[in-house]
Interface confidence: low
């Protein structure tokens, strides 16, 4: 109970996941890869390993650069964060998977769900990632 939680600079997760509907649209927010900036003084710049498809704003929000149907070729990519002063670099994997239709969802209600998912309202054309404890 007297434990002190130490802040670790970098991405708090090894992999960020988002469940999306098939049609991804230009400007659609996909998920937030929040970087843990412990002293608050670091100026971090984000970069995507697939800049033609995914872009990251200064808040770590990842969104689609263009419209495309989600497929296995877009399913995994990397996000890099770089300290502008020290040039120190961190990376994290992003995994996108297809959201089942509502019909499929009702059948799979009892199936185990990943911890990080889009609630129903974050779908096809919209949404930022939210943590949901299951």
């Amino acid at each position: 109970s007297g434990e002190i939680a130490l802040c670790k600079t970098g991405f708090p997760e090894d992999v960020y996941s988002a469940v999306l509907s098939k049609d991804v649209h230009e400007g659609q927010p996909l998920l937030n890869v929040k970087f843990s900036n412990c002293n608050g003084k670091r100026k971090v710049q984000y970069e995507s390993s697939e800049p033609a498809d995914f872009k990251v704003d200064e808040d770590g929000m990842v969104y689609a650069v263009r419209s495309f149907p989600l497929s296995s070729e877009h399913a995994k990519f990397l996000i890099y964060a770089q300290d502008k002063e020290t040039q120190e670099k961190w990376q994290v994997a992003v995994k996108l998977s297809l959201k089942p239709t509502l019909t499929e969802e009702s059948v799979k209600e009892s199936a185990e769900v990943e911890e990080i998912v889009f609630p129903r309202q974050f779908s096809k054309h919209s949404g930022h990632l939210q943590r949901q404890k299951r």
Epitope: S21, K22, D23, H25, E26, G27, Q28, P29, D57, M61, Y63, S67, P69, T101, R120, Q121, F122, S123, K124, H125, S126, G127, H128
Partner: antibody
Framework: EVQLQQSGPELVKPGASVKMSCKAS????????MHWVKQKPGQGLEWIGY????????KYNEKFKGKATLTSDKSSSTAFMELSSLTSEDSAVYYC????????WGQGTTLTVSS | ENVLTQSPAIMSASLGEKVTMSCRAS?????MYWYQQKSDASPKLWIY???NLAPGVPDRFSGSGSGNSYSLTISSMEGEDAATYYC?????????FGSGTKLEIK
């Protein structure tokens, strides 16, 4: 209950501009795109464009570029569409629509352009 | 832009009759959406992702298709189904609508 409440009917003169609103309630405004759709009397539906209120990204149908400007105000959960240089061709009902599957529609704003 | 052509433009059906209307896209799309609109009312989402019925839509409705060709079917026409039905694609902007099929009671 999710609702998209649109502003009332407008009667404006040719050459003028008009700004109509669409107030969202019952859901998190920034969670959905807001689409705008035009319907002329007795005719079909025409997609104007959308605004993503979360990051203020807009996408327009080329046909409406320069005619329509989409904006939003997160604090009041309201989307706006301004139409400029109005002519009789712009007389129509304008709908806002949003939701996970575009399943929420406003009641429509009737715009009449007449001298 | 992707032009959606709906046919027929107008059709009439007797109560209990099976009804099928189609929507053809000039370019292939991933999914089709359908809306129902009655006179002086806002459109209502009717079918999403080609074949999923929106909440409250009777199960006599169904949707199918892929690529360039999609259809909406009513297994047994009822009076409340008289309306105009529009298809819409979300695969590439502009998110075009079809010109609509007006369904009347015979």
């Amino acid at each position: 209950e999710v609702q998209l409440q649109q502003s009332g009917p407008e009667l404006v003169k040719p050459g003028a501009s008009v700004k109509m609103s669409c107030k969202a309630s019952g859901y998190t405004f920034t969670s959905y795109l807001m689409h705008w759709v035009k319907q002329k009397p007795g005719q079909g539906l025409e997609w104007i464009g959308y605004i993503n209120p979360y990051i203020d990204v807009t996408k327009y149908n080329e046909k409406f570029k320069g005619k329509a400007t989409l904006t939003s105000d997160k604090s009041s959960s309201t989307a706006f569409m301004e139409l400029s240089s109005l002519t009789s061709e712009d007389s129509a009902v304008y709908y806002c629509a949003g939701g996970d599957y575009e399943d929420y529609w406003g009641q429509g704003t009737t715009l009449t352009v007449s001298s | 832009e992707n032009v959606l052509t709906q046919s027929p433009a107008i059709m009439s059906a007797s109560l209990g009759e099976k009804v099928t209307m189609s929507c053809r896209a000039s370019s292939s799309v991933n999914y089709m959406y359908w809306y129902q609109q009655k006179s002086d009312a806002s459109p209502k989402l009717w079918i999403y992702y080609t074949s999923n019925l929106a909440p409250g839509v009777p199960d006599r409705f169904s949707g199918s298709g892929s690529g360039n060709s999609y259809s909406l079917t009513i297994s047994s026409m009822e009076g409340e189904d008289a309306a105009t039905y529009y298809c819409q694609q979300f695969s590439s902007p502009p998110f075009t609508f079809g010109s609509g099929t007006k369904l009347e009671i015979k």
